[in-house]
């Protein structure tokens, strides 16, 4: 119950907190579990205990092992265990899974990425942030206190983010890096009665006889992933596929998510080699979802 995994990289600072926390006034003793040898409290040592904290300044691979902390609380001496692993620095960019802290999720509204374990260290701003080993640049990225804020989060922002900072101990500086994955999730969605953005109701579209013409049916259905939503064209109240005119076909446009976050769909009606009889047809743009169906009608007119 009171055992905790901690990890770090060689030649970086690593500070571990006793998993068995007590009140600040409680004495905490630290031991190497294997040898039961007490860890010194003098700061001149590379590895030393400082109350609830065990400090490796800097850490070495050989420091790996289990450390016991005993909190001298009233009634009982309470025991905790810190399982420390120090890894060699990677030569390539990939951060292995065992060096990863917990994954965090963000969305358009909330895109904070906290730098893991930073609260244990004596650091000063600013933090440096990297994504997939590249330093983050641009106005979308803001390092604020112990976290990174990403403006206008997109799915492409998902990835591994590394924070880098300097720990200061008695005038000496030690580097610390920590990496965690960031995923982008949809905001909690909702659906509403379809709203047709184009065409306008009873719109008259001018076309040239003998030329090609495109009509776009565009509608929005709510926010986030929609369970059921569709846009389609009808000719004289008949599905395009059933109408039987090969010159007139519909093809799906791109799913769209506008800047206001609404989930929208497009359907393009393509009329090849516009003929005189096409002007007599009624073109209906239909948008439907669980809330119901909305229809906007378009008619074609000859361009003068």
């Amino acid at each position: 119950k009171f055992s905790k995994q901690s990890w770090g990289l060689e030649n970086e600072a690593l500070i571990v907190r006793c998993p068995r926390q007590g009140k600040p006034s409680y004495t905490v003793d630290w031991y190497y579990s294997q040898t039961n040898k007490s860890i010194p409290t003098q700061e001149r040592n590379r590895v030393f205990a400082s109350g609830q904290l065990l400090k490796f300044l800097p850490a070495e691979v050989a420091d790996s092992g289990i450390y016991t902390c005993i909190v001298r609380s009233p009634t009982f001496n309470r025991t905790g265990y810190a399982n420390v692993t120090i890894y060699k620095k990677q030569s390539d960019c990939n951060v292995p899974d065992y060096l990863m802290y917990s994954t965090v999720s963000g969305s358009e509204k909330n895109s904070k990425i906290y730098c893991p374990t930073i609260d244990l260290y004596n650091w000063t701003a600013p933090l440096e942030w990297f994504k997939n080993c590249q330093a983050l640049q641009g106005s979308r990225y803001r390092a604020h206190k112990s976290f990174l804020v990403i403006d206008n989060v997109m799915t492409e922002d998902a990835g591994d983010y590394t924070c880098k900072f300097i720990h200061n101990e008695n005038g000496a500086n030690y580097s610390v890096t920590a990496t965690r994955s960031f995923t982008v999730k949809d905001e909690q969605g909702f659906s509403l009665f379809p709203v047709i953005g184009a065409p306008a109701q009873n719109e008259i579209k001018e076309v040239e006889i003998g030329k090609n013409a495109n009509l776009t049916c565009s509608a929005c259905f709510g926010k986030g992933t929609q369970f059921l939503a569709a846009v389609l064209w009808q000719l004289n109240g008949t599905k395009i596929t059933d109408f039987g005119e090969p010159r007139i076909q519909q093809e799906e446009g791109q799913n769209q998510s506008f800047s206001n976050g609404l989930a929208c769909l497009d359907m393009v009606l393509r009329i090849a080699d516009v003929k005189e009889e096409d002007l007599l047809l009624q073109y209906d743009c239909l948008a439907l979802n669980l809330h119901g169906l909305r229809r906007h009608t378009v008619r074609l007119s000859r361009k003068n």
């Epitope: 119950k1 007590g22 009140k23 409680y26 009233p74 009634t75």
Partner: antibody
Framework: EVQLVESGGGLVQPGGSLRLSCAAS????????MHWVRQTTGKGLEWVSA???????YYPGSVKGRFTISREDAKNSLYLQMNSLRAGDTAVYYC????????????????WGQGTTVTVSS | DIVMTQSPLSLPVTPGEPASISCRSS???????????LDWYLQKPGQSPQLLIY???NRASGVPDRFSGSGSGTDFTLNISRVEAEDVGVYYC????????FGGGTKVEIK
């Protein structure tokens, strides 16, 4: 109402075993240190064992290796497994609530059960 | 182990009169958090022990204000300002600094 109810006492022969239970109610059992305290007839109180919220256990030398304290937080229950019983273990056994082991708040041993009697005799 | 010594062993009292019980520990009961881990309990005839005072001087919930605790380091006192008939029983001091140890008890009875 905050309450502790012990059960499982009885007559047992020397060298025998007995398991005491304590049912807790009316408080968040899982965050508290819990104790067993015994009282021999006409004598004083003696601490027998304790368990903290992490499940770490504590015993005096007189029962170490013979008694085992345990807890089942899901059932709000405390147990005392007593093996290799001796005549000197004859007593009323009380289940008692200690400090809040989560926040390290101590307000005394503030809740006691009614006790269960253990008699070790041939 | 911390040893707790109580005195007197027996205390005959007169209702309405004050009474005090002394408790001494084999080592200081002061913890680094600044509190003395010394409690007082009363066991009335045929009942379970009940908490009176915790951390040296704090009255437990529901305990009449005629009961008070004082002391520091290794020497502690339980005072009853005006004894009442319902106060009879055995009083125990207990240290909770290192596990639990009880004093031998003081039997309070009406004269």
């Amino acid at each position: 109402e905050v309450q502790l109810v012990e059960s499982g006492g009885g007559l047992v022969q020397p060298g025998g075993s007995l398991r005491l239970s304590c049912a807790a109610s009316g408080f968040t059992f899982s965050t508290y240190d819990m104790h067993w305290v015994r009282q021999t007839t006409g004598k004083g109180l003696e601490w027998v064992s304790a368990i903290d919220l992490a499940g770490d256990t504590y015993y005096p030398g007189s029962v170490k290796g013979r008694f085992t304290i345990s807890r089942e937080d899901a059932k709000n229950s405390l147990y005392l497994q007593m093996n290799s019983l001796r005549a000197g273990d004859t007593a009323v056994y009380y289940c008692a609530r200690g400090g809040d082991g989560y926040n390290y708040d101590y307000y005394g041993i503030d809740v006691w059960g009614q006790g269960t009697t253990v008699t070790v005799s041939s | 182990d911390i040893v707790m010594t109580q005195s007197p062993l027996s205390l005959p009292v007169t209702p309405g009169e004050p009474a005090s019980i002394s408790c001494r520990s084999s080592q200081s009961l002061l913890h680094s958090d600044g509190y003395h881990y010394l409690d007082w309990y009363l066991q009335k005839p045929g009942q379970s022990p009940q908490l009176l005072i915790y951390l040296g001087s704090n009255r437990a919930s529901g305990v009449p204000d005629r009961f008070s605790g004082s002391g520091s380091g290794t020497d502690f006192t339980l005072n009853i300002s005006r004894v009442e008939a319902e106060d009879v029983g055995v009083y125990y001091c207990m240290q909770a600094l290192q596990t639990l140890t009880f004093g031998g008890g003081t039997k309070v009875e009406i004269k």
